[in-house]
Interface confidence: low
């Protein structure tokens, strides 16, 4: 079968890193600089991705593989293959359309990316708050109130400003 296919289509014999050049009697020509073909039998080479601006080159383009980008310091990748770079915020903040904003009371973010998430509600598990939450850290739940000595109190946070997982608009 392979043999028949090769006879019908000489281009199927062109390896990765080349293209089947119809202008030159279907000879396999090397991909020109700044282009690549990652599979055999291609009639054109693909233009290499250019990592410009906020993107920086993580892996150079070669004749057989595309360049790979990541983000300059202060930004992080989003999307498949780092298709976008999003600004980092500090821990205790989230990125909104107006820039980095502190997490509302009752929520936290322990990373430089993503949104503020509500503190764990210890009372849902019948536990008490052992360590209060901050903008950067979740609460630490301790033993249930019944296990505490008399006079101990627990802190229950107010309801969060929005539902968990809701993206900022």
């Amino acid at each position: 079968f392979e043999r028949t296919r090769s006879l019908q289509d000489p281009c199927s014999n062109c390896p990765a890193g080349t293209f089947c050049d119809n202008n030159r009697n279907q000879i396999c020509s090397p991909c020109p600089p700044n282009s690549f073909s990652s599979a055999g039998g291609q009639r054109t080479c693909d233009i290499c991705r250019q990592c410009k601006g906020v993107f920086r080159t993580r892996k150079e383009c070669s004749s057989t593989s595309n360049a790979e980008c990541d983000c300059t310091p202060g930004f992080h990748c989003l999307g498949a293959g780092c298709s976008m770079c999003e600004q980092d915020c500090k821990q205790g903040q989230e990125l909104t359309k107006k820039g980095c904003k502190d997490c509302c009371f009752g929520t936290f973010n322990d990373q430089k990316r993503g949104i503020c998430r509500p503190w764990t509600n210890c009372s849902l598990d019948g536990k008490s708050v052992l360590v209060n939450g901050t903008k950067e850290r979740d609460v630490v739940c301790g033993p249930s109130p019944a296990d505490l000595s008399p006079g101990a109190s627990s802190v229950t946070p107010p309801a969060p400003a929005r539902e968990p997982g809701h993206s900022p608009q």
């Epitope: 090769s6 199927s12 014999n13 062109c14 390896p15 990765a16 890193g17 080349t18 000879i27 396999c28 020509s29 090397p30 991909c31 020109p32 600089p33 700044n34 055999g40 150079e60 383009c61 070669s62 004749s63 057989t64």
Partner: antibody
Framework: QVQLQQPGAELVKPGASVMLSCKAS????????MHWVKQRPGQGLEWIGE????????NYYEKFKTRATLTVDKSSSTAYMQLSSLTSEDSAVYYC?????????WGQGTLVTVSA | NIVMTQSPKSMSMSVGERVTLSCKAS??????VSWYQQKPEQSPKLLIY???NRYTGVPDRFTGTGSATDFTLTISSVQAEDLADYHC?????????FGSGTKLEIK
């Protein structure tokens, strides 16, 4: 007529560096990747790396990455390979070549002899 | 790294005989294999690319076959001028690698 011109021979001392040149003519210089290949006397071929003649991007065989540096001077249509910290194991013929599939062009090779 | 193993290391043939050279890849390289002829004191010259395509100007007594891991170069009727080393090489993945060569001598 595509030609890749290389000097015939270089004699260098152990521990020193050598800069090999490859001057291209007869085609649009930046149209291809330039590869460098090593051949020790009586032995097979060993790929060192390639350079994108348009933007200087490089890919190296890990084994040579720390000691080989590929560069290009577009104004003179010349590709260069610098090889550093030479030992007797580096005594070989070094070819510049437009290697990937067809067309295929090879320089005549530069014989590098490492000797005190 | 993909290792290309050529056999035999050397062979001695009479003019007019059929010659078969083998090249085995340690991993699948598709058809991204080339064969090169290197005559004494010369640089290599491309014979076959894409496993089976004869390069421009190469006599039709040279034939390449194979895919994946097993490749063969056949010279249907060897001539005196075919005295040379023959190298196979893969351009399927980095680093590109070559076999150690087969030396063809003419009796």
């Amino acid at each position: 007529q595509v030609q890749l011109q290389q000097p015939g021979a270089e004699l260098v001392k152990p521990g020193a560096s050598v800069m090999l040149s490859c001057k291209a003519s007869g085609y649009t210089f930046t149209s291809y990747w330039m590869h460098w290949v090593k051949q020790r006397p009586g032995q097979g071929l060993e790929w060192i790396g390639e350079i994108n003649l348009r933007n200087g991007g490089t890919n190296y065989y890990e084994k040579f990455k720390t000691r080989a540096t590929l560069t290009v001077d577009k104004s003179s249509s010349t590709a260069y390979m610098q090889l550093s910290s030479l030992t007797s194991e580096d005594s070989a013929v070094y070819y510049c070549t437009i290697l990937t599939s067809a067309p295929s062009y090879w320089g005549q090779g530069t014989l590098v002899t490492v000797s005190a | 790294n993909i290792v290309m193993t050529q056999s035999p290391k050397s062979m001695s043939m009479s003019v007019g005989e059929r010659v078969t050279l083998s090249c085995k890849a340690s991993d699948n390289v598709g058809i991204s294999v080339s064969w090169y002829q290197q005559k004494p004191e010369q640089s290599p010259k491309l014979l076959i690319y894409g496993a089976s395509n004869r390069y421009t100007g190469v006599p039709d007594r040279f034939t390449g076959t194979g895919s994946a891991t097993d490749f063969t170069l056949t010279i249907s009727s060897v001539q005196a001028e075919d005295l040379a080393d023959y190298h196979c090489g893969q351009s399927y993945s980095y680093p590109f690698t070559f076999g150690s060569g087969t030396k063809l001598e003419i009796k």
